[in-house]
């Protein structure tokens, strides 16, 4: 590993999805038809783009982004109605900085309610809390700009779940690209 | 040179509560998670607490949980360990740490004998 | 009892290979990083390798980390008298919120 750790190789904390199918790895089956289809990846904790060969493979399959995220994502539909309300900037943009307890090495993000402006980081990878961001973009679509031009930014965001750590769950919202199994 | 020193240990009475420190000169702890780890006589090492640098994040073994409350004073570059309703298998030596990214700093420990 | 697991002792002689082994889970070795400390009898211990397979400066190469699925291993080649200690992982642990140590091995230089 670099020193910019992969998340599926982290000491990064997970959060359970809402159906153990969502569990399962993507299965693309052994026909040869080429299907794009979305499964839930446990590890980024988002869903994700796979090819599906059209036959077989198992219910971690959604033959679209949104259904598998009402699916597999807590608190989805919930954020995505706040989302698209209006520009209220989540809660979670005003946490102070937390790399959290652990000798990971991430580079992160966060929102700096002082400048009002997303600067980078380095997380610990566990613990923490969800002022936390793999990407510039991500940031500032959420807690910079909430609601300005594409509007769903805070579609792929988890509610926080009510653990014994001071602000809540994990901060894993990732935006990965294609993470085939 | 970065040294971590550990006081606060001794004998006491099953029930009874103790109070680490864990002093640290020669680095500024602000921006660092500090632990506590602790080995028993004759034992492994068993991690016990940890705090993040802005105290926001606070871990616990399941065994201590409930009893042992861990703070830190960033101001006078110090990490502590409340350990109350003490218990005979929490006697162990103790440990300060510090896991940076590429290294540590560990203290050389202070003893806590719990018994009647 | 801990939930990573290492054989309780491991032996060699001056100049062999040893291997040690740490065995886990998912919700430990298999999604975190492990580190790997030396502890030299009455001593603190002391970092050998950290998020798998780096090396802090001042450990010899020597000594080396690598992790596959849900277990982890440290590799001491070229075995000196000076190795004899035991050996910890250690690794986040996502169920129990937790850092949790290996069992810890013995490794003796025999001859």
């Known amino acids: 590993l670099s020193e910019e750790a992969d998340d599926t190789d982290s000491e990064l904390g997970s959060m359970k999805p809402l159906h153990t199918f969502c569990a399962m790895k993507a299965d693309d089956g052994p026909c040869k038809a080429m299907i794009r289809s979305y499964f839930f990846n446990m590890y980024t904790h988002q869903c994700e783009e796979f090819i599906y060969g059209g036959c077989e493979g198992n219910e971690n399959r959604f033959d679209t982004l949104e259904e598998c995220k009402k699916t597999c994502i807590p608190g989805y539909e919930k954020t995505a109605v706040k989302a698209a309300s209006g520009a209220e900037r989540p809660d979670f943009c005003f946490l102070e900085e937390d790399p959290g307890l652990c000798r990971g090495y991430m580079k992160r993000y966060l929102y700096n309610n002082q400048t009002k402006q997303c600067e980078r980081f380095v997380y610990g990878g566990c613990l923490g809390n969800r002022n936390n961001f793999e990407t510039l973009d991500e940031c500032k679509k959420i807690c910079e700009n909430p609601g300005g031009g594409s509007g769903g930014g805070l579609n792929d965001i988890f509610e926080a779940q009510k653990i014994e750590w001071h602000e809540g769950g994990p901060p894993h919202h990732h935006h990965h690209h294609h993470h085939h199994h | 040179e970065v040294q971590l020193v550990e006081s606060g240990g001794g004998l006491v009475q099953p029930g009874r509560s103790l109070r680490l420190s864990c002093a640290v000169s020669g680095l500024t702890i602000d921006n660092y998670a500090m632990q506590w780890v602790r080995q028993a006589p004759g034992k492994g090492l068993e991690w016990v607490s940890g705090?993040?640098?802005?105290?926001?994040?606070?871990g616990y073994a399941d065994s201590v949980k409930g009893r042992f409350t861990i703070s830190r004073d960033n101001a006078k570059n110090s990490l502590y360990l409340q350990m109350n309703s003490l218990r005979a298998e929490d006697t162990a030596l103790y440990y300060c740490?510090?896991?940076?990214?590429?290294?540590?700093?560990w203290g050389q420990g202070t003893l806590v004998t719990v018994s009647s | 009892q801990s939930v990573l697991t290492q054989p309780p002792s491991a032996s060699g002689t001056p100049g062999q290979r040893v291997t040690i082994s740490c065995s886990g889970s998912?919700?430990?070795?298999?999604?975190?990083?492990v580190h790997w400390y030396q502890q030299l009898p009455g001593t603190a211990p002391k970092l050998l390798i950290y998020r798998n397979n780096h090396r802090p400066s001042g450990v010899p190469d020597r000594f080396s980390g690598s992790k596959s699925g849900t277990s982890a291993s440290l590799a001491i080649s070229g075995l000196r008298s000076e190795d004899e200690a035991d050996y910890y992982c250690?690794?986040?642990?996502?169920?129990?919120?937790?850092?949790?140590f290996g069992t810890g091995t013995k490794v003796t230089v025999l001859g």
């Open positions: 705090i993040s640098g802005n105290s926001r994040s606070i």
């Open positions: 740490a510090i896991f940076l990214h590429e290294s540590d700093y």
């Open positions: 998912t919700s430990n070795i298999g999604t975190m990083y």
């Open positions: 250690l690794a986040w642990d996502d169920t129990l919120r937790a850092y949790v």
